[in-house]
Amino acid sequence: QDPYVKEAENLKKYFNAGHSDVADNGTLFLGILKNWKEESDRKIMQSQIVSFYFKLFKNFKDDQSIQKSVETIKEDMNVKFFNSNKKKRDDFEKLTNYSVTDLNVQRKAIHELIQVMAELSPAAKTGKRKRSQMLFRGRRASQ
Amino acid sequence: QDPYVKEAENLKKYFNAGHSDVADNGTLFLGILKNWKEESDRKIMQSQIVSFYFKLFKNFKDDQSIQKSVETIKEDMNVKFFNSNKKKRDDFEKLTNYSVTDLNVQRKAIHELIQVMAELSPAAKTGKRKRSQMLFRGRRASQ
């Protein structure tokens, strides 16, 4: 059994999250994850989910009673999602920490927008780029 | 030329983001994107970048002078990053809108944590799962 399982059960007790009523009104993440089988689509969704958990854990960082559980789960997330790669984790953390209300950050983001956009679609790296762009013009929602 | 280019240039003027000093102290996104060649790694990073831009655009939704530019860019982001797939975009938006301070959301998130974690590594979806779990005991990052 992975180390996170026991610690997640501990968090369930702490958050009173074991009751069946918690599942009322559908799931947060599981239903969405079920929709996406493609690895790259899953990474798009999981990126948001992982950043949510890291934010949640940050909010409880001073609560000693769950510290060990939180640290163990974070460690296992780093192993599983970032493949134990600290550079990947650090780059991710930088992105999640940028403040959208900081004027300098806003200016930089707009300054970089054209280049970011050019790299957004997987096709951006291949010769298929131009043709797929033209298809989109004619049948915008066909994908 | 893609429609977003002209509109992004318009935003650059609005945000005074065309000056060379904007590039001081390094980039926000471009340096990070340069580090990751693997498509799934790129999606992890781009997911955070795209959510940043959507948040930024939301903050300026009442500014009529850039409305057309923002809408054009958002539409092109939906084409490029979400492959024109509205369901993908909607699921993404749901994830970005969950409030980390909402008690019900917290309980649900903790309730789903074990299953979310089980799906985090790419091996989780394949027949390799059981065997890789055992390999992980010996060499956790072997996948």
């Epitope: 600290k86 | 060649k37 990052a141």
Partner: antibody
């Protein structure tokens, strides 16, 4: 001040076993991954194994996989390396090293090393 | 698996600048952090650069690290060379499964 003190080295015959220990102090032991790195006489550094802060994740070089086992006791601030089926090519100084992060990430502090000699 | 290739030895005079390269044979040099370790004769290694270009406290700013994606290599630069810099220098990074890889080491001689 960070201190790492290795012990347990010595002379052993091929096929034999040894258990190395590394006593750590001066930092929150469970918050950092730990590694074993070795250096054969007159040769370069060779990474052997690493273990995450909780002990939940372990990593091994191909040359030792299946023969060596890394473990840690966070209550005792101690790192271990159980070495079985030893070979002549395992002869080296074995360094215990503290990593920068909770998962293997490069080392910021190294012990003085303990010498393992495998010979008949 | 990839290799990290370093020059076997380099030499330079005191006060000068020397650069030691570390070339990754496959996979991107940028996809994992690179560390540099100094090992003086008869001593344990010490870290002079971590996470591509960061210096641990106590390491003088004469030591700097960089990575170059075009040559897929990392570099350690030591300026204002001193005799005490004479040592073996090792670069280190990780493969895609996060197993640790060391370069073969470079013997720096200060003439």
């Amino acid at each position: 001040e960070v201190q790492l003190l290795e012990s347990g080295g010595g002379l052993v015959q091929p096929g034999g076993s040894l258990r190395l220990s590394c006593a750590a102090s001066g930092f929150t032991f469970s918050s950092y991954a730990m590694s074993w790195v070795r250096q054969a006489p007159g040769k370069g550094l060779e990474w052997v194994s690493a273990i995450s802060g909780s002990g939940g994740s372990t990593y091994y070089a191909d040359s030792v996989k299946g023969r060596f086992t890394i473990s840690r006791d966070n209550s005792k601030n101690t790192l271990y390396l159980q070495m079985n089926s030893l070979r002549a090519e395992d002869t080296a100084v074995y360094y215990c090293a503290k990593d920068f992060w909770v998962i293997t990430s490069g080392n910021d502090y190294w012990g003085r090393g303990t010498t393992v000699t495998v010979s008949s | 698996n990839f290799m990290l290739t370093q020059p076997h030895s380099v030499s330079e005079s005191p006060g000068k600048t020397v650069t030691i390269s570390c070339t990754r044979s496959s996979g991107s040099i940028a996809s994992n952090y690179v560390q540099w370790y100094q090992q003086r004769p008869g001593s344990s290694p010490t870290t002079v650069i971590f996470e591509d270009n960061r210096r641990p406290s106590g390491v003088p700013d004469r030591f700097s690290g960089s990575i170059d994606t075009s040559s897929n290599s990392a570099s350690l630069t030591i300026s204002g060379l001193k005799t005490e810099d004479e040592a073996d220098y090792y670069c280190q990074s990780f493969d895609s499964t996060n197993l640790v890889v060391f370069g073969g080491g470079t013997k720096l001689t200060v003439l």
